[in-house]
């Protein structure tokens, strides 16, 4: 049990202890939540107190003070889905429709997803707002026909579903054109060919 | 303190349209996705859309193609433009601050009734 | 989309009781859960978000637990006021999905 003396510099538990060089001694790091209110001696372990509202210490640390929490920063794009708690700081993610574009231990700044353009669909992410859209092509037999970065293709429209024929095929970019059975195909349609 | 109002609701035909205005304040509306919620008669929450602070949006399947949100950052305004109404689409209609819907208005009701 | 199975859809106590619900997701969410109190002819209000945390100004009867699947709202003592109908509510996908609700009723 800390404090003990260390002659190699190591401690037993290095996730809950830490080495004191001055008195050459394992003391006990405080627990996520709290600070190191006083330090350790040869005859007395560390003694921590809880971080003061608005503060935090996520590791068990030998720190003699708790950071601050920030909030998210919307003009950043940035939006708060956890509180920071004495023991976590401030989870924040990006808006819908923006990916993360600057990162330093953390996202900084959020930017809008690029459209994927008509014939194409964003590739889907397993994480929401890591990174921008990779647009890639509408699979056979689907169509998308606008500029987002949300739309998904869409299955062409089976004429024969509706009890109606194809009068054009479907595209990447448009649907199916159906038309009623009874209708008479206009000439350039027609398939007779006079010679 | 965080204030949503909608407007815009009322009695309206199957296949008509109306657009329901929510207006914001009490908060820097430009800087925060806003999130449409409804809510039917005696039913639970469905999730109609969100809209970025660029103006992105995404829909539930149900109403993609029929309902359009936009808003008007100058204004303070978030708005949902409500097509080919159906009987199913009776609701209160509810916006919500954020894509996380932390703060609600007190909800606008569509009736779509012949 | 990620399915929220919130049990019971009702459930009958008197004031002073504890009363637990639980609500459960079809696919892990981390603690992206919110719950929420709606009265007859009002708005929802958030009571609690990130699975645990307390809406300032909520009373500290309330209390949330729970990660990945597994949820639970807790009213420790409850109070006349407390009668509602509650809601979880998953924000892990931006698409957000509701649990069916919980009616409170008065024994």
């Known amino acids: 049990v800390p404090p003990y003396g260390s002659e190699n510099q190591t401690c037993r538990d290095q996730e809950k202890e830490y080495y004191e060089p001055r008195h050459r001694i394992c003391c006990s790091r405080c627990p996520p939540g709290t600070y190191v209110s006083a330090k350790c001696s040869r005859s007395r372990d560390t003694v921590c107190a809880t971080c003061a509202e608005n503060s935090y210490n996520e590791h068990w640390n030998y720190l003699t003070i708790c950071q601050l929490c920030r909030p998210c920063d919307p003009v950043m794009g940035l939006e708060e889905i956890a509180p920071c708690t004495s023991k976590r700081k401030t989870q924040c993610r990006c808006q819908p429709g923006m990916f993360c574009a600057a990162w330093a231990l953390e996202c900084t700044h959020c930017e809008l997803l690029s459209d994927c353009p008509p014939g194409t669909e964003a590739e889907l992410k397993d994480e929401v707002g890591k990174g921008n859209n990779h647009c890639v092509p509408c699979k056979a037999g689907h169509f998308q026909n606008t500029s987002s970065p949300s739309a998904r293709c869409q299955p062409h429209t089976r004429c024969e579903d509706q009890g109606l024929v194809e009068a054009a095929p479907g595209t990447a970019q448009s649907d199916t054109t159906c038309r009623n059975p009874s209708e008479s195909l206009p000439p350039e349609m027609s398939g007779t060919m006079l010679m | 303190e965080v204030q949503l109002l909608e407007s815009g609701g009322g009695l309206v035909q199957p296949g008509g349209s109306l657009r329901l205005s929510c207006a914001a304040s009490?908060?820097?509306?430009?800087?925060?996705?806003m999130t449409w919620v409804r809510q039917a008669p005696g039913k639970g929450l469905e999730w109609i859309g969100v809209?970025?602070?660029?103006?992105?949006?995404y829909y539930t399947d149900s109403v993609k193609g029929r309902f359009t949100m936009s808003r008007d950052n100058s204004k303070n305004t978030l708005y949902l433009q409500v097509n080919s109404l159906r009987a199913e689409d009776t609701a209160v209609y509810y916006c919500?601050?954020?894509?996380?819907?932390?703060?609600w208005g007190q909800g606008t009701t569509v009736t779509v009734s012949s | 989309d990620i399915q929220m199975t919130q049990s019971p859809s009702s459930l009958s106590a008197s004031v002073g009781d504890r009363v637990t619900i639980t609500c459960q997701a079809s696919?892990?969410?981390?603690?992206?859960l919110s719950w929420y109190q709606q009265k007859p002819g009002k708005a929802p209000k958030r009571l609690i978000f990130?699975?645990?945390s307390l809406e300032s100004g909520v009373p500290s009867r309330f209390s949330g637990s729970g990660s990945g699947t597994d949820f639970t709202l807790t009213i420790s003592s409850l109070q006349p006021e407390d009668f509602a109908t509650y809601y979880c509510?998953?924000?892990?996908?931006?698409?957000?999905?509701f649990g069916g609700g919980t009616k409170l009723e008065i024994k």
């Open positions: 809209i970025n602070s660029g103006g992105g949006t």
């Open positions: 509510q998953q924000y892990n996908s931006y698409s957000l999905t």
């Open positions: 990130a699975a645990s």
């Open positions: 009490g908060f820097t509306f430009s800087y925060y996705a």
């Open positions: 919500a601050k954020a894509s996380t819907a932390d703060v």
């Open positions: 696919q892990g969410i981390s603690n992206y």
